[in-house]
Amino acid sequence: AQPFAHLTINATNIPTGSHKVSLSSWYHDRGWAKISNMTFSNGKLIVNQDGFYYLYANICFRHHETSGDLATEYLQLMVYVTKTSIKIPSSHTLMKGGSTKYWSGNSEFHFYSINVGGFFKLRSGEEISVEVSNPSLLDPDQDATYFGAFKVRDID
Amino acid sequence: AQPFAHLTINATNIPTGSHKVSLSSWYHDRGWAKISNMTFSNGKLIVNQDGFYYLYANICFRHHETSGDLATEYLQLMVYVTKTSIKIPSSHTLMKGGSTKYWSGNSEFHFYSINVGGFFKLRSGEEISVEVSNPSLLDPDQDATYFGAFKVRDID
Amino acid sequence: AQPFAHLTINATNIPTGSHKVSLSSWYHDRGWAKISNMTFSNGKLIVNQDGFYYLYANICFRHHETSGDLATEYLQLMVYVTKTSIKIPSSHTLMKGGSTKYWSGNSEFHFYSINVGGFFKLRSGEEISVEVSNPSLLDPDQDATYFGAFKVRDID
């Protein structure tokens, strides 16, 4: 059967800080999260079956003044979907997206979402992971911050 | 086999100008770029097989103050994915996306990404192309600016 | 045959106001809009066949000064793609996206687009609907505001 995964953010374990970090805590078996013929391990989505896959990610950032002041009003809110090959230890960014934002103290609430998607050849054993900037601003809802993949066709 | 394409921007040949410009230089056979049972010619992705396809585009714009001043702080950053039918010479926009942005001189770096996607009936010979505003601001990385398509099913 | 739908906004019947509302008027059989083995009824996309589907939405908002002043310059421009189960009367958000925006009176035109997409298990009889904030700002073009789904695989 065709492999797929839809992984939703595990909000109990979001890293702090504003730098670029790899998100390693995702749900794979609760709510909308699910996986079949792929493996989730050590924060990475592992390919078990060669093929062409459509990969996607939706990342939401938010801040409310009740959470305290931001360190800066100028933010880079970014996502990077990366592929790591174990055989040849290397990591490459497949997709990136985001925006610089001016989240002024004049507004009590701020929100921003990023969506990226693309069609990629993946080999068994390769690993997909998601990095973001400003992880402390991530929206922890399962409808907000997630990534996934589904196999579309075999490699000829 | 099911047709697909994932085309990444060819940064050596990005047009100048600002208004709505068709992007004609894309890679189809290096890095993440690939194509099968579709044709890339004259800056357009040509359909070789009737079917229903999922089309997508990811377009990133960026500016750093070291590149010089912008003409204006108010920008329209837009993408249009269009379909052209040769038999009936006509061009129609399938998908559009983007944002007006205020890229203030108070910040040294600016970034913004657009993602669009949709499911469309395409006939053999029809051509898909991508137009953007402000092409001089395009991010030339293969993970940043790309578009693609993959066939999902036949037309009944 | 694999079910799919691509529904485009019916601009003759967009709700007014700035609150969160369900969009119930969509085209399913004109221009780019189409449907097969799914049903559109009462503003909802009804699943007729169990399966895993890729769902997507593209929502564009715009405002021109000729339309008159906005009530506020600080806006929440949001989309929510929801699933309703009739058997167990409940509604759940599958995907959300959007941004808070500062649409200053210093610019004569404003535009912003949201794209969301994800892979979900849908059962026959379940209904997909789209809610947005600020519906009066929706771009009524078929290339701008649409949502859709296509079946990728059966449930094992």
């Epitope: - | 600002s18 208004h19 010089g68 912008l70 204006t72 702080e73 920008l75 329209q76 001189g105 001089s136 | -």
Partner: nanobody
């Protein structure tokens, strides 16, 4: 909306100088690219000069390069065109314009880049 009002035109002998002023009101002047265009009797309106929002970059038509200087004072919401070594061929109605949306200053040598226009001021250069 941005309102633009030109002034400073008049009659001058060849070789003389004039300084045109464009006063802006309404929106935030400093965020717009600004330009000067001119239209001679019986001719199309043509580009003269453009300046970016900060005043740090300028662009000129070949016919006025080295003779005309565009500048702006964002604190005063004012655009200027200093015209030296005037020639009879410079006779025209001069218009100032404001535009936004596009990053490349070269685009502001085209009329379609601009949203707002003034009513114009007449410049006549006699031989």
């Amino acid at each position: 909306e941005v309102q633009l009002v030109e002034s400073g035109g008049g009659l001058v002998q060849a070789g003389g100088s004039l300084r045109l002023t464009c006063a802006a009101s309404g929106r935030t002047f400093r965020s717009y690219a600004m330009g000067w265009f001119r239209q001679a009797p019986g001719k199309e309106r043509e580009f003269v000069a453009a300046i970016n929002y900060s005043g740090g970059s300028t662009n000129y038509a070949d016919s006025v390069k080295g003779r005309f200087t565009i500048s702006r004072d964002n604190a005063k919401n004012t655009l200027y065109l200093q015209m030296n070594s005037l020639e009879p061929e410079d006779t025209a109605v001069y218009y100032c314009a404001a535009g936004s949306g596009y990053a490349s200053l070269s685009y502001y040598s085209t009329e379609r880049a601009y949203t707002y226009w003034g009513q114009g001021t007449q410049v006549t250069v006699s031989s």
